[in-house]
Interface confidence: medium
């Protein structure tokens, strides 16, 4: 079906500054697969740290921090010839605009570390 | 505390299922750091696939797919004693409710794979 010319593209510079958003969330149970134990079983394991902000939705965000600088080898030892690095993802959150307007929000971007991966280091050779 | 006249009307039958959201995004340049090359250097490398939907904000989302079932070892070969697995994150996006209502959106959850990590497999012993 052709798009209604009255519907601006969300990336358009003329896109409305304020929109009405329904909080009846679609795909509410998309998360029925629960958090995995990859953080423990990874060769670049990570811990989860609680980031809480009561003026934001979601109020509590758990951020990954790599446990080691190196990666865990088959023997369970940390190999410093490899690097554990965070995989970061930009997410949208809702920021309450004002305490006096509890139902007015602003979109905010946040960069969160979701987990860690093991990479080969970049070797800088001296001249 | 008296209600701010600029706030959405609490008498509205849809209140507070609908809220006002400003799209004047805070921390817009949070991702000004150049995308890393971890996807290529990881022992669990991945490719990025473009997921585009004009009725969604953001319209373009990049999803990771692990290149191998196993992980890449120091010799550059795939070791099938280890597993490459996607690290998934649930994100909030805005879905246009109707082509005829350009300023009405609904929050939607999406599960996206951000990257891959290398894990020790769970061994199921036969009885």
């Amino acid at each position: 079906m052709p798009r209604n010319p009255g519907c601006p593209n969300a990336e358009d510079k003329n896109f409305p500054q304020n929109v009405k958003v329904s909080l009846n969330i679609l795909n509410k149970s998309v998360n029925s697969r629960r958090p995995s134990d990859y953080y423990n079983r990874s060769t670049s394991p990570w811990t989860l740290h609680r980031n809480e902000d009561r003026e934001r939705y979601p109020s509590v965000i758990w951020e990954a921090k790599c446990r080691h600088l190196g990666c865990v080898n088959a023997e369970g030892n940390v190999d410093h010839h490899m690097n554990s690095v965070p995989i970061q993802q930009e997410i949208l959150v809702l920021r309450r605009e004002s305490q006096h307007c509890p139902h007015s929000f602003r979109l905010e971007k946040m960069l969160v570390a979701v987990g860690c991966t093991c990479v080969t280091p970049i070797i800088h050779h001296m001249a | 505390m008296p209600r701010n006249p600029g706030c959405p009307n609490a008498e509205d039958k849809n209140f507070p299922q609908n809220v006002k959201v400003s799209l004047n995004i805070l921390n817009k340049s949070v991702n000004s750091r150049r995308p890393s090359d971890y996807y290529n250097r990881s022992t669990s490398p991945w490719t990025l696939h473009r997921n585009e939907d004009r009725e969604r904000y953001p319209s373009v989302i990049w999803e990771a797919k692990c290149r191998h079932l196993g992980c890449v070892n120091a010799e550059g070969n795939v070791d099938h004693h280890m597993n490459s697995v996607p690290i998934q994150q649930e994100i909030l996006v805005l879905r246009r409710e109707s082509q005829h209502c350009p300023h009405s959106f609904r929050l939607e959850k999406m599960l996206v794979a951000v990257g891959c990590t290398c894990v020790t497999p769970i061994i199921h012993h036969m009885a």
């Epitope: 029925s32 958090p35 995995s36 979601p58 758990w62 139902h103 | 299922q17």
Partner: antibody, heavy 126, light 107 residues
Framework: EVQLVQSGAEVKKPGESVKISCKAS????????ISWVRQAPGQGLEWMGG????????DYAQKFQGRVTITADESTTTAYMELSGLTSDDTAVYYC???????????????????WGQGTTVTVSS | EIVLTQSPDFQSVTPKEKVTITCRAS??????LHWYQQKPDQSPKLLIK???HSISGVPSRFSGSGSGTDFTLTINGLEAEDAATYYC?????????FGQGTKVDIK
């Protein structure tokens, strides 16, 4: 550790209303939801409805729709459940339960009830 | 609404024995299934969340498994203090619903 403390026992007559409070301490009140669950004598658990504090959204079980109202007062970190048009069938212990709202390891909204109030006994009798 | 059916309704068990309680959902609920323990005149207590995730402070003898429509709560080596009623709870679809409960008694 989140603690939920409920108001005391109530005795009501048929047709009356009851309003029970649930005071939360420990943890940010806005970071979780509160559900209300009741248990009739010798019976199982029955979910009545819940509120998500951040947006103030309420969800009610169809059975109680129109008869139950769940509210929250952030300034006192207290949730309330009001049930009207009481009958003897509403004689039960009423519990408030915390529903976490964490973006846990990349996931929004965990829906287990990880902390419960001590329960409020409501007796409806003429 | 989603109906959860627990079995058995009642179980009398000797200490140190293994107890298995099952919970069947009327439709697929993924892993949105939680287990609670309720002792007489007490509030329910969360034992297992999301089918198999353990809760800190809950003894390791309690474990959960299953996904989709069939779930199991296992108590490995029952202790006297485990005498209680056990409930399963689904949070996949509103309204939240509970199983009818399984009463576990010590012989």
């Amino acid at each position: 550790e989140v603690q939920l403390v409920q108001s005391g026992a109530e005795v009501k007559k048929p047709g009356e209303s009851v309003k029970i409070s649930c005071k939360a301490s420990g943890g940010s009140f806005r970071s979780y939801g509160i559900s209300w669950v009741r248990q009739a004598p010798g019976q199982g658990l029955e979910w009545m409805g819940g509120i998500t504090h951040f947006f103030g959204i309420t969800d009610y079980a169809q059975k109680f729709q129109g008869r139950v109202t769940i509210t929250a007062d952030e300034s006192t970190t207290t949730a309330y459940m009001e049930l009207s048009g009481l009958t003897s069938d509403d004689t039960a212990v009423y519990y408030c339960a915390r529903e976490p709202n964490d973006f846990w390891n990349g996931y929004y909204d965990t829906h287990d009830f990880d902390s419960w109030g001590q329960g409020t006994t409501v007796t409806v009798s003429s | 609404e989603i109906v959860l059916t627990q079995s058995p309704d009642f179980q009398s068990v000797t200490p140190k024995e293994k107890v298995t309680i099952t919970c069947r959902a009327s439709q697929n609920i993924g892993s949105e299934l939680h287990w609670y323990q309720q002792k007489p005149d007490q509030s329910p207590k969360l034992l297992i969340k999301y089918a198999s995730h353990s809760i800190s402070g809950v003894p390791s003898r309690f474990s959960g498994s299953g996904s989709g429509t069939d779930f199991t709560l296992t108590i490995n080596g029952l202790e006297a203090e485990d005498a209680a009623t056990y409930y399963c709870h689904q949070s996949d679809t509103l309204p939240h619903t509970f199983g009818q409960g399984t009463k576990v008694d010590i012989k």
